[in-house]
Interface confidence: low
């Protein structure tokens, strides 16, 4: 018997062909011999089956000896053997209807689990294979789970259900709710204005929630909350902000924070959390601030950086257009009795300058 796979909610067309290429009498019945539909001359007649309002045929094909059964808005319980009676012969078609749904919601926070559940007719033994947008395959039977969703898992998941060597494909759009970057680092000279941006990796029509930026300054023994805010339909309103530093926050997305000036006591790491309405869990983005200061005290020229720097970063002091006088993988360098001229303090990573501060040393007479 022919096997046809269908998708819940879709339309399926079961074919039935007579040897005579003309309109003759036919009937479609289910396995309980209940008539679904048939014809009387050129009229379509329907029987007392539960498919009554969802079953149809194509009258335009009857003259060619084709008598299809069309079932709309398929349900799992439509899975059955359908029998077409035409020309004293019977054609049997087994219809198996499957449904594939994502757990609770297709909008999931980064790090959460995605569970895809297959609805299948009793007695079937399908296998499912899903390919994520980043190309990873997962396999299973009635349920498939992926733990620790990543940003790259956002997009269309293509799932193939295999039964009796036949395939049916489902596409499910998954949105992973996350910030575009897990972590960012800002390098600033002392006194400069600092801009922190927290772009989201997704767009939704209405976005409501609340957030907070906790800051652990390098010099401080404990972290503290710098700002708390609310988000209503993509509009940002500040609830509470510290007096020192007094952060400013943009009123629109992307989330944007301004620190009036970079000071050594602010250098450190922050964690911005965003709790979205109707979601358990929070979005996180780490932000780091590195501050540089170049000073001249009497006969000592010093350059210092504060904040979370990698051990491979190089701090150098050099006179403009000359070789570096001092270059160390440390957070402070100095030159005693510096020559007069414009000195540059450079923080670099493998030759790439991340931060630069200039200081003029005047000649001594």
């Amino acid at each position: 018997k022919k096997v046809v796979l269908g998708k819940k909610g879709d339309t399926v067309e079961l074919t039935c062909t007579a040897s005579q290429k003309k309109s003759i009498q036919f009937h479609w019945k289910n396995s309980n011999q209940i008539k679904i539909l048939g014809n009387q001359g050129s009229f379509l007649t329907k029987g007392p089956s539960k498919l009554n309002d969802r079953a149809d045929s194509r009258r335009s094909l009857w003259d060619q000896g084709n008598f299809p059964l069309i079932i709309k808005n398929l349900k799992i319980e439509d899975s059955d053997t359908y029998i077409c009676e035409v020309e004293d012969q019977k054609e049997e078609v087994q219809l198996l209807v499957f449904g594939l749904t994502a757990n609770s919601d297709t909008h999931l926070l980064q790090g959460q689990s995605l569970t895809l559940t297959l609805e299948s007719p009793p007695g079937s033994s399908p296998s499912v294979q899903c390919r994520s947008p980043r190309g990873k395959n997962i396999q299973g039977g009635k349920t498939l789970s992926v733990s620790q969703l990543e940003l790259q898992d956002s997009g269309t998941w293509t799932c193939t259900v295999l039964q009796n060597q036949k395939k049916v494909e489902f596409k499910i759009d998954i949105v992973v709710l996350a910030f575009q970057k897990a972590s960012s680092i800002v390098y600033k000279k002392e006194g400069e204005q600092v801009e922190f941006s927290f772009p989201l990796a997704f767009t939704v029509e209405k976005l409501t929630g609340s957030g907070e930026l906790w800051w652990q300054a390098e010099r401080a023994s404990s972290s503290k909350s710098w700002i708390t805010f609310d988000l209503k339909n993509k509009e940002v309103s500040v609830k509470r902000v510290t007096q020192d530093p007094k952060l400013q926050m943009g009123k629109k997305l992307p989330l944007h924070l301004t620190l009036p000036q970079a000071l050594p006591q602010y250098a450190g790491s922050g964690n911005l959390t965003l709790a979205l309405e109707a979601k358990t869990g929070k979005l996180h983005q780490e932000v780091n601030l590195v501050v540089m200061r170049a000073t001249q005290l009497q006969k000592n020229l010093t350059c210092e950086v504060w904040g979370p720097t990698s051990p491979k970063l190089m701090l150098s002091l050099k006179l403009e257009n000359k070789e570096a006088k001092v270059s160390k993988r440390e957070k402070a360098v100095w030159v005693l009795n510096p020559e007069a001229g414009m000195w540059q303090c450079l923080l670099s990573d493998s030759g790439q300058v991340l931060l630069e501060s200039n200081i003029k040393v005047l000649p001594t007479w």
Epitope: N137, Q139, G141, K142
Partner: antibody, heavy 122, light 107 residues
Framework: QVQLVQSGAEVKKPGASVKVSCKVS????????MHWVRQAPGTGLEWMGY????????IYTQKFQGRVTMTEDTSTDTAYMELRSLRSEDTAVYYC???????????????WGKGTTVTVSS | ETTLTQSPAFMSATPGDKVTISCKAS??????MNWYQQKPGEAAIFIIQ???TLVPGIPPRFSGSGYGTDFTLTINNIESEDAAYYFC?????????FGQGTKVEIK
Amino acid sequence: QVQLVQSGAEVKKPGASVKVSCKVSGHTLTELSMHWVRQAPGTGLEWMGYFNPRDDETIYTQKFQGRVTMTEDTSTDTAYMELRSLRSEDTAVYYCATGGNKDYYFYYMDVWGKGTTVTVSS
Amino acid sequence: ETTLTQSPAFMSATPGDKVTISCKASQDIDDDMNWYQQKPGEAAIFIIQEATTLVPGIPPRFSGSGYGTDFTLTINNIESEDAAYYFCLQHDNFPLTFGQGTKVEIK
């Protein structure tokens, strides 16, 4: 360290059934996927199916559908594979193999049993 | 169904030789390929996972390469204890399928 110990060799007549056991030690069976694989004389390995603990379900390959049953007794950490309506071509060495207990690693077959020889002969 | 074509079926090597075994998949399977070693009367041993990653505890003379459809198991400086039956397994799609196996003999 997971170890698998399989039951001894069996000789069966065509039409009979055979039940091969696989005892797990070093880990609880409930957290491991369990695969069954066979190798007939002179042929390659053939996957028969597996049990997925997270979803508590068994998947059989089309070829063995309706003739094989894979079960587990969690109280003794023992997995079983029963093959019915035996034919001479079912003469083979039957192996159990476990996968890991993480999402993508159910299919790894990282630890294998030594195999159980089943001979089907009249 | 993904068919794995493994070659050669048999090979003879001398200690110190470099041996390569090929496994070709009939369709793209990303890096979802594992390699195993089996000695007579013993349980199979998992040696390479995800095409290129050496399983902990396996000597570094074993290595795997490949992606997509063409995969290779390499044994550098083969030793007498490496005489065994080697087979590949794809776990990209159901049904899981195996290569026909390669018997490696040491002279």
